[in-house]
């Protein structure tokens, strides 16, 4: 079956820094700001363009090893990312892959927030276990949490 | 805040030399693809030069190919213009413009979103 | 290289009046990511060029919503819905698909 799942979490960062910092360079910059998160980025096919595979590698005592990641889509024009979770982490005997949406749009004080669609191709009559998605969002808000200090911090970048 | 300032323009003979300069500020500049673009007196806009965020890839117009030389100093956060055997016609005025930024997902381009306050160049005897 | 041709190259217009100039481009600015890499910009009297639309109709930071622009492959418009006093100025067309990046040659915006 499918099971959607959606998020919202606001930031003080304008969409079009976020961006930039969380979506367009987040490969560089997240295992820079959270590597207790996130150890490395690699692309294994492609140039970052949709189709790409990346392989994320998770640090050590994580409950995974690594995730491999499809980008579906970037469009730069309306802030709006697609990628699927296609090997590694959850994603096995009980879950054949995870559909994921980040759209950044304009918050009225400035900011922005942040949507997250998750859709979860599960086989057979498996169902999501709401502790995992749970989990899952809370790890998406702390990435953002860092990269949000370190945009703060570092008055320069990503403008 | 984000700006880029021109500066090494002047009076100068056919046949003379400048440096032209533009030191970036309030973003990150080795992320960017940079453009020189010029403006006679009375006339519209021409394009003239770019080169990308490392510096390995540099294009040029027909018009000055062979007598600037565009480049650029990622930890000056500057980029230079190199114009020999100056002509009367390249007397305008020079802007340095930012063009599209790259990252880890790619080069994207967002238009020519900031532009210097110009420089100006006069080729006269 | 890619001819840009602006019409019309004078344009005077009643404040509060719409305003529409047009672009046309020898070949097409259609790129393989989607997107048309034609910009709009607008030069006032004395000051730098500053960019209006990128990509064909996106509006840039800070720009107005008065300003639009439309239009895909050869052919392109920028409209103002309402001209305001300090809409004067030139405008130019600029291709970005290929180098060298080349402008249309102006269209002056002047008020009636």
């Known amino acids: 079956g499918v099971f959607n799942y959606e998020a919202e979490t606001p930031s003080v960062i304008p969409a079009a820094r976020l961006f930039k910092a969380f979506i367009l360079d987040g490969d560089k910059l997240l295992p820079k700001v959270a590597p207790e998160a996130v150890s490395s980025v690699e692309n294994i096919e492609g140039n970052g363009g949709p189709g790409t595979i990346k392989k994320i590698t998770f640090p050590e005592g994580s409950p995974f090893k690594y995730v491999k990641e499809r980008v579906d889509e970037v469009d730069r024009v309306n802030f709006k990312y697609s990628f699927s979770v296609i090997e590694g982490g959850a994603v096995g005997d009980a879950l054949e892959k995870v559909c994921n949406e980040i759209k950044i749009v304009a918050a009225p004080d400035g900011g922005s927030i942040l949507k997250i669609s998750n859709k979860f191709h599960t086989k057979g009559d498996h169902e999501i276990n709401a502790e995992q998605i749970k989990i899952e969002k809370e790890k998406a808000v702390g990435l953002l949490k860092a990269v949000e200090s370190y945009l703060l911090a570092h008055s320069d970048a990503y403008n | 805040q984000v700006q880029l300032v021109e500066s090494g323009g002047g009076l100068v003979k056919p046949g003379g030399s400048l440096r032209l300069s533009c030191a970036a500020s309030?973003?990150?500049?080795?992320?960017?693809?940079m453009n020189w673009i010029r403006q006679a007196p009375g006339k519209g806009l021409e394009w003239i030069s770019l080169?990308?965020?490392?510096?390995?890839?540099?294009y040029y117009s027909d018009s000055v190919k062979g007598r600037f030389t565009i480049s650029r100093d990622n930890a000056r956060k500057s980029l230079y213009l190199q114009v020999n055997s100056l002509r009367a016609e390249d007397t305008a005025v020079y802007y340095c413009?930012?063009?599209?930024?790259?990252?880890?997902?790619?080069?994207?381009?967002?238009?020519?979103?900031?532009w210097g306050q110009g420089t100006t160049v006069t080729v006269s005897s | 290289d890619i001819v840009m041709t602006q019409s019309p190259l004078s344009l005077p217009v009643t404040p509060g009046e719409p305003a529409s100039i047009s672009c046309r481009s020898s070949q097409s600015l259609l790129h393989s990511d989607g997107y048309n890499y034609l910009d709009w910009y607008l030069q006032k009297s004395g000051q730098s060029p500053q960019l209006l639309i990128y990509?064909?109709?996106n509006r840039a930071s800070g720009v107005p919503d008065r300003f639009s622009g439309s239009g895909s492959g050869t052919d392109f418009t920028l409209k103002i819905s309402r001209m305001e006093a300090e809409d004067v100025g030139v405008y130019y067309c600029m291709q970005a698909l290929q180098t060298p990046y080349t402008f249309g040659q102006g269209t002056k915006l002047e008020i009636k």
């Open positions: 413009a930012r063009d599209r930024g790259e990252w880890a997902l790619g080069a994207y381009y967002y238009g020519l979103d900031v």
């Open positions: 080169i990308s965020s490392s510096g390995s890839a540099i």
């Open positions: 990509l064909g109709s």
């Open positions: 309030g973003f990150t500049f080795s992320d960017y693809y």
